[in-house]
C-alpha cells in the first residue's frame, strides 16, 4: 500500500488530524465494487438503507456513490515534514442526505441520514492500494478499514502493513 510502514505508526495521527477545508477539493460519482468485481448495492428496506455485496446480473445497472474528497492535515510531529503531511479523506453518499458511517462498536458499516457538518464517523482516509484499487480507513478508529465479510460491508482491523493488500479491503471505483 502507498504510504504504509506499520499501520499504527502514523495512524495515531488520525484522531488528531483536522480537515483543512469545509469544502471538498473534488467530488466523483462512481460505482463501487470489490477486488473480485462484486458490486456494492444499496436497498431501501423498512425505511432504512441496507448495504449488500453481490454479483449483478448482466446489464443490471450499478448503484452510484458520490465520493467527496477532503484534505486532512497530519499534526506536524507525526508526519515529520511540518505542514506538508496531508492525507486524503473521503465521504461516501449513495443517495441524498445519507452517508456511510463507521459503527466501531458493532464493527459495521451503516447508512445514516445526517446534516453537514458530518460527524467524524462519516470520514475515511483514502489509501491507494494494490495497483488501481483503493481502501477506506476509519478516521475514528485508525487501523480499521471498510471490508467485505459474509456478503456485507464490515469494519476490519488491519494490524500490519503486509495485510493492507488483502483482497477483502480493496475496492475499485468506476464511472460505468
Amino acid at each position: 500500500a502507498f504510504g504504509i510502514s506499520g499501520v499504527q505508526k502514523y495512524t495515531r495521527a488520525l484522531h488528531d488530524s483536522s480537515i483543512t477545508g469545509i469544502s471538498p477539493i473534488t467530488e466523483y460519482l462512481a460505482s463501487l465494487s470489490t477486488y473480485n468485481d462484486q458490486s456494492i448495492t444499496f436497498a431501501l428496506e423498512d425505511e432504512s438503507y441496507e448495504i449488500y455485496v453481490e454479483d449483478l446480473k448482466k446489464d443490471e445497472k450499478k448503484d452510484k456513490v458520490l465520493l467527496s474528497y477532503y484534505e486532512s492535515q497530519h499534526p506536524s510531529n507525526e508526519s515529520g515534514d511540518g505542514v506538508d503531511g496531508k492525507m486524503l479523506m473521503v465521504t461516501l453518499s449513495p443517495t441524498k442526505d445519507f452517508w456511510l458511517h463507521a459503527n466501531n462498536k458493532e464493527h459495521s458499516v451503516e447508512l445514516h441520514k445526517c446534516e453537514k457538518p458530518l460527524p467524524d464517523q462519516a470520514f475515511f482516509v483514502l489509501h491507494n492500494m494494490h495497483s488501481n484499487c483503493v481502501s477506506f480507513e476509519c478516521k475514528t478508529d485508525p487501523g480499521v478499514f471498510i471490508g467485505v465479510k459474509d456478503n456485507h460491508l464490515a469494519l476490519i482491523k488491519v494490524d500490519s502493513s503486509e495485510n493492507l493488500c488483502t483482497e477483502n479491503i480493496l475496492f475499485k471505483l468506476s464511472e460505468t
Partner: antibody, heavy 122, light 107 residues
Framework: EVQLVESGGGLVQPGGSLRLSCAAS????????MSWVRQAPGKGLEWVSA????????YYADSVKGRFTISRDNSKNSLYLQLNSLRAEDTAVYYC???????????????WGQGTLVTVSS | DIQMTQSPSSVSASIGDRVTITCRAS???SSWLAWYQQKPGKVPKL??????SLQSGFPSRFSGSGSGTDFTLTISSLQPEDFATYYC?????????VGQGTKVEIK
C-alpha cells in the same frame, strides 16, 4: 525542509547498467510513495516508476518494464533505481519525486530532487 | 494506457494576456490531474493538483478546471515569471502518463 538528492548518474555504454540513489531528508520517507521521473535533453517529462511507502508495491512505465527496478530502504532514508540493459533512448535527467499525500498517490508530486544525468552512448 | 494530449504545444503571449492550456485524457480520470510548471534549467514544480486545487506558493492568477477527460489550465493575466513549460499528468491509474508539454513564450 524536505530535501531529495539524487546521485549515481554518469556515462554508460549501451547494454550497460547503473544504480541511481535518492537520499531523502526532512520527512518520514516510509509514509510516502516515491517515484522516478525522467527528462531527455530538450524533451518533456516521462514518469518511469513508483514504489509504495512500504516498498511492497512497484509500478513501471512500459518503456522500462523488465529493465529497471525500483526499491527503497526506509531505514537509510533512500530510494533507488537499478537501470539494466540501457539504451540510447534512456539518456535523460532522472528525478526522484515525493507524492503530495501520505496515503494516496492522487495528488501528484509535491517535491522533486535536482536530478542526475544518465548518458547512454558508445 | 491513458494518453494525455496537451494543446497547444506552444503559445506566444504578452504580459497581461489570458492564457489557456488544455489537456485531454484518452479515458476518464475523474479529477486526478496535476499540472506542473518548469522553467528552463529548473526542476518541475507542482502547480495544481486534483484538477483545480492550487498548490501553496502560486498566485491566484493560476487556475485549473475540468473533470473526466477534458481539463484546462488558465493564467488570467500573464506575468514575466510565468514564462515556462507546463505539463499535465494523470495520477488516476498506472501507468501514470504525462502530456507532451506547452511552452509559454514571450510575444
Amino acid at each position: 525542509e524536505v530535501q531529495l538528492v539524487e546521485s549515481g548518474g554518469g556515462l554508460v555504454q549501451p547494454g550497460g547498467s547503473l544504480r541511481l540513489s535518492c537520499a531523502a531528508s526532512g520527512f518520514t520517507l516510509s509514509s510516502y510513495a516515491m517515484s522516478w521521473v525522467r527528462q531527455a535533453p530538450g524533451k518533456g517529462l516521462e514518469w518511469v516508476s513508483a514504489i509504495s511507502g512500504s516498498g511492497g508495491s512497484t509500478y513501471y512505465a512500459d518503456s522500462v518494464k523488465g529493465r529497471f527496478t525500483i526499491s527503497r530502504d526506509n531505514s537509510k532514508n533512500s530510494l533507488y533505481l537499478q537501470l539494466n540493459s540501457l539504451r540510447a533512448e534512456d539518456t535523460a535527467v532522472y528525478y526522484c519525486a515525493k507524492t503530495l499525500y501520505t496515503t494516496s498517490w492522487y495528488g501528484g508530486f509535491q517535491h522533486w530532487g535536482q536530478g542526475t544525468l544518465v548518458t547512454v552512448s558508445s | 494506457d491513458i494518453q494525455m494530449t496537451q494543446s497547444p504545444s506552444s503559445v506566444s503571449a504578452s504580459i497581461g494576456d489570458r492564457v489557456t492550456i488544455t489537456c485531454r485524457a484518452s479515458q476518464g480520470i475523474s479529477s486526478w490531474l496535476a499540472w506542473y510548471q518548469q522553467k528552463p534549467g529548473k526542476v518541475p514544480k507542482l502547480l495544481i493538483y486534483a484538477a483545480s486545487s492550487l498548490q501553496s506558493g502560486f498566485p491566484s492568477r493560476f487556475s485549473g478546471s475540468g473533470s473526466g477527460t477534458d481539463f484546462t489550465l488558465t493564467i488570467s493575466s500573464l506575468q514575466p515569471e510565468d514564462f515556462a513549460t507546463y505539463y499535465c499528468q494523470q495520477t488516476h491509474s498506472f501507468p501514470w502518463t504525462v502530456g507532451q508539454g506547452t511552452k509559454v513564450e514571450i510575444k
